[in-house]
């Protein structure tokens, strides 16, 4: 008989050498091969033979090494729930969805199931940048010094105040967190003391 270097092989302690690619089959008390991603179990292993796998049919998938007897059905991203597709379903991977622009994930169960509109940030604030877009609702933070934001918006960013001198203008009113600097043309008339000298 052949040496049991490969499944199926007996396991008394209910553990297998390769946990990712093998599983313990309690009925026969043996370790058997799992099926690779994109496949499923068509024939379970037996005392004399290892697992037999089959490819997932169109519109179905299995993402991991598995001993499932069916493939998971591909599901579309539900626009009613505020989701959009970023990558299609394949035999090895489910459909990849994300929240539509201007929305955040409001319900999470292993993956996002429901998105809601992002809250507006009031004038003088902007949404704090997140590592992952759509992961949470907006957290509004004040504009930093020298910047302003003058709308109620979920996505507007604080902009730097206009520098009047860069445009050949002078400052009429300083900028605030909610408004830009007001600029005006430089005064044309000379100072009064200068005008007397000129008349003479």
């Amino acid at each position: 008989s052949q040496p049991q270097a490969v499944p199926p092989y007996a396991s008394e302690n209910q553990t297998c050498r390769d946990q990712e690619k093998e599983y313990y089959e309690p009925q026969h008390r043996i370790c058997c091969s799992r099926c690779p991603p994109g496949t499923y179990v068509s024939a379970k292993c037996s005392r004399i033979r290892d697992t037999v796998c089959a490819t997932c049919a169109e519109n179905s998938y299995n993402e991991h090494w598995n001993y499932l007897t069916i493939c998971q059905l591909c599901r579309p991203c539900d626009p009613v729930m505020g989701l959009e597709e970023i990558a299609p379903c394949t035999s090895k991977r489910k459909t990849q969805c994300r929240c539509q622009p201007g929305m955040f994930c409001a319900a999470w169960a292993l993956e996002c199931t429901h998105c809601e509109l992002l809250s507006d940030c009031p004038p003088g604030t902007e949404a704090e940048l997140k590592d992952e877009v759509g992961k949470g609702n907006n957290h509004c933070v004040p504009c930093k010094a020298g910047h302003f934001q003058n709308t109620s918006s979920p996505s507007a960013r604080c902009q730097p105040h206009t520098r009047c001198e860069n445009q050949g203008l002078v400052e009429a009113a300083p900028g605030t967190a909610q408004s830009d600097t007001t600029c005006k043309n430089p005064l044309e008339p000379l100072p009064p003391e200068m005008s007397g000298t000129m008349l003479m």
């Epitope: 179990v41 068509s42 024939a43 379970k44 037996s46 499932l68 007897t69």
Partner: antibody
Framework: EVQLVESGGGLIQPGGSLRLSCAAS????????MSWVRQAPGKGLEWVSV???????YYGDSVKGRFTISRDNSKNTLYLQMNSLRAEDTAVYFC???????WGPGTLVTVSS | EIVLTQFPGTLSLSPGEGGTLSCRAS???????LAWYQQKPGQAPRLLIY???RRVIGIPDRFSGSGSGTDFNLTISSLEPGDFAVYYC?????????FGQGTRLEIK
């Protein structure tokens, strides 16, 4: 010990119907890959149909639309419903499972007028 | 469907000799899901090899399978009287399973 026993074979006229049964012991039919294979007198093996562990069913081109594979969990039995039988369906029908690990002795189906 | 062609049709050998039976597929067999069976007169076939090269537990190591893609072989070393039979290859990598026409191994 695994055992498979086919029954239901016999002489049938062309166009007639027959249901073959395969009683299994030593394992659970509903949990396993089960198949029917036939062998015409003096000829080679021809695969007929399969039902996977998860319930998917498939058929050979020559029987598609005429034969139906099924299983009864409570009786631990596999079936092959054969309709619109033809002379070329004459063969010994073997039940196999799990997978093709074990085979029954076979049952002879003769389609003749 | 995948057509399997076995050759030779008949192989004549003496006990103690070794021999190789071949099976060619009309297209690539998925995951090398090819099996070999032995059938003696009046009996049901017996599974010997699956997955092209994996011997069923309990089958003597005189039987070995090899090959991949479209070309597969069953090698029997040191033939015993009980080995003379008909051998079939089978692909089960597609949902439409097929058998080869068989090779008769007879005593010379």
């Amino acid at each position: 010990e695994v055992q498979l026993v086919e029954s239901g074979g016999g002489l049938i006229q062309p166009g007639g119907s027959l249901r073959l049964s395969c009683a299994a012991s030593g394992f659970t039919v509903s949990d396993n890959y089960m198949s029917w294979v036939r062998q015409a007198p003096g000829k080679g093996l021809e695969w007929v149909s399969v039902i996977y562990s998860g319930g998917n069913t498939y058929y050979g081109d020559s029987v598609k639309g005429r034969f139906t594979i099924s299983r009864d969990n409570s009786k631990n039995t596999l079936y092959l419903q054969m309709n619109s039988l033809r002379a070329e369906d004459t063969a010994v029908y073997f039940c196999t499972g799990p997978f093709f690990d074990y085979w029954g002795p076979g049952t002879l189906v003769t389609v003749s007028s | 469907e995948i057509v399997l062609t076995q050759f030779p049709g008949t192989l004549s050998l003496s006990p103690g000799e070794g021999g190789t039976l071949s099976c060619r597929a009309s297209q690539t067999v998925w995951s090398n899901y090819l099996a070999w069976y032995q059938q003696k007169p009046g009996q049901a076939p017996r599974l010997l090899i699956y997955g092209a090269s994996r011997r069923v537990i309990g089958i003597p190591d005189r039987f070995s399978g090899s090959g991949s893609g479209t070309d597969f072989n069953l090698t029997i070393s040191s033939l015993e009287p009980g080995d003379f039979a008909v051998y079939y290859c089978q692909q089960y990598g597609s949902s439409s399973i097929t058998f080869g026409q068989g090779t008769r191994l007879e005593i010379k």
